[in-house]
Amino acid sequence: NKILVKQSPMLVAYDNAVNLSCKYSYNLFSREFRASLHKGLDSAVEVCVVYGNYSQQLQVYSKTGFNCDGKLGNESVTFYLQNLYVNQTDIYFCKIEVMYPPPYLDNEKSNGTIIHVKGKHLCPSPLFPGPSKP
């Protein structure tokens, strides 16, 4: 039995930050779980981990230097990524694993979300336009 995951096909991070919501076909209430976000077609980089259980508050961490936070819903985890770089534009996959109660459950691989990180462009202010062309 596998959990199904839904995520937006594409998100644009205009301000180098993005909220990526992972929606599950499973209620996480009073479960011990590990939700994670993975970067790349091969999911080689674990971007962020959200760990939750019935007796502790949510714990969020990244071992790979990403600035991330997480929020828990009954059937979702939302990852908030900040300080993203343009070269971190990639496909990102949600993963969910339920550790307790048994049996261990995880998800069918989702379609992923392409996060397109837009660089901050410094545009000339309309009050101070650049030198006019002759």
Epitope: K63, G65, M99, Y100
Partner: antibody, heavy 120, light 107 residues
């Protein structure tokens, strides 16, 4: 209380295999990885690999990938490390230890160690 | 693999001394570093996790600091039971690797 209890000392001949067990108690077995670490006489600590009992996924140190096999029997909360084609430089104390699967930060509980001696 | 280099490999100190052990990682491991104490014939014991967090039951004379590639374990006032070997370990990426150890001996 939380405990990891390992099997007893073994003496093996070069070329043979050894299988060390590690019985866990006092915690939810499927919430933690079991790692294996060895220590040759007078030497430092060397990580062999780990297994997660929930889905039986393993990670191995490349050095041991072709000779070490990590398994678990969740029904009796026991992990096993089998090392094949033993050589004299495999003589060491082998420890099992655990790290949390959700918060994989450290090895907080260790077995007492199993001495494996390889000698002809 | 990430190489962990500990220094010194051994040191002699007296009870009451302040002792500092350093650990260098061959690449950025952020805060993913632990310190263990091991006595002869025994299994290692966790002292510090995530660079600076004291494990439950460990005396407050032990402290850890650092991030990135350089880390320090400090014993503020060495006690007789602290004579042992200390190891750093990175848990940022597999394979997890240990430093070579620092043996703290009685002067």
């Amino acid at each position: 209380q939380v405990q990891l209890v390992q099997s007893g000392a073994e003496v093996k001949k070069p070329g043979a295999s050894v299988k060390v067990s590690c019985k866990a108690s006092g915690y939810t077995f499927t919430s933690y990885y079991i790692h294996w670490v060895r220590q040759a006489p007078g030497q430092g600590l060397e990580w062999i690999g780990c297994i997660y009992p929930g889905n039986v996924n393993t990670n191995y140190n490349e050095k041991f990938k072709d000779r070490a096999t990590l398994t678990v029997d969740t029904s009796i909360s026991t992990a096993y490390m089998e090392l094949s084609r033993l050589r004299s430089d495999d003589t060491a104390v082998y420890f099992c230890t655990r790290s949390h699967y959700g918060l994989d930060w450290n090895f907080d509980v260790w077995g007492q160690g199993t001495t494996v001696t390889v000698s002809s | 693999d990430i190489q962990m280099t500990q220094s010194p490999s051994s040191l002699s100190a007296s009870v009451g001394d302040r002792v500092t052990i350093t650990c260098h990682a061959s690449q950025n491991i952020y805060v993913w570093l632990n310190w263990y104490q091991q006595k002869p014939g025994k299994a290692p014991k966790l002292l510090i996790y995530k660079a600076s967090n004291l494990h439950t039951g460990v005396p407050s004379r032990f402290s850890g600091s650092g991030s990135g590639t350089d880390f320090t374990l400090t014993i503020s006032s060495l006690q007789p039971e602290d004579f042992a070997t200390y190891y750093c370990q990175q848990c940022q990426t597999y394979p997890y690797t240990f430093g070579g150890g620092t043996k703290v001996e009685i002067k």
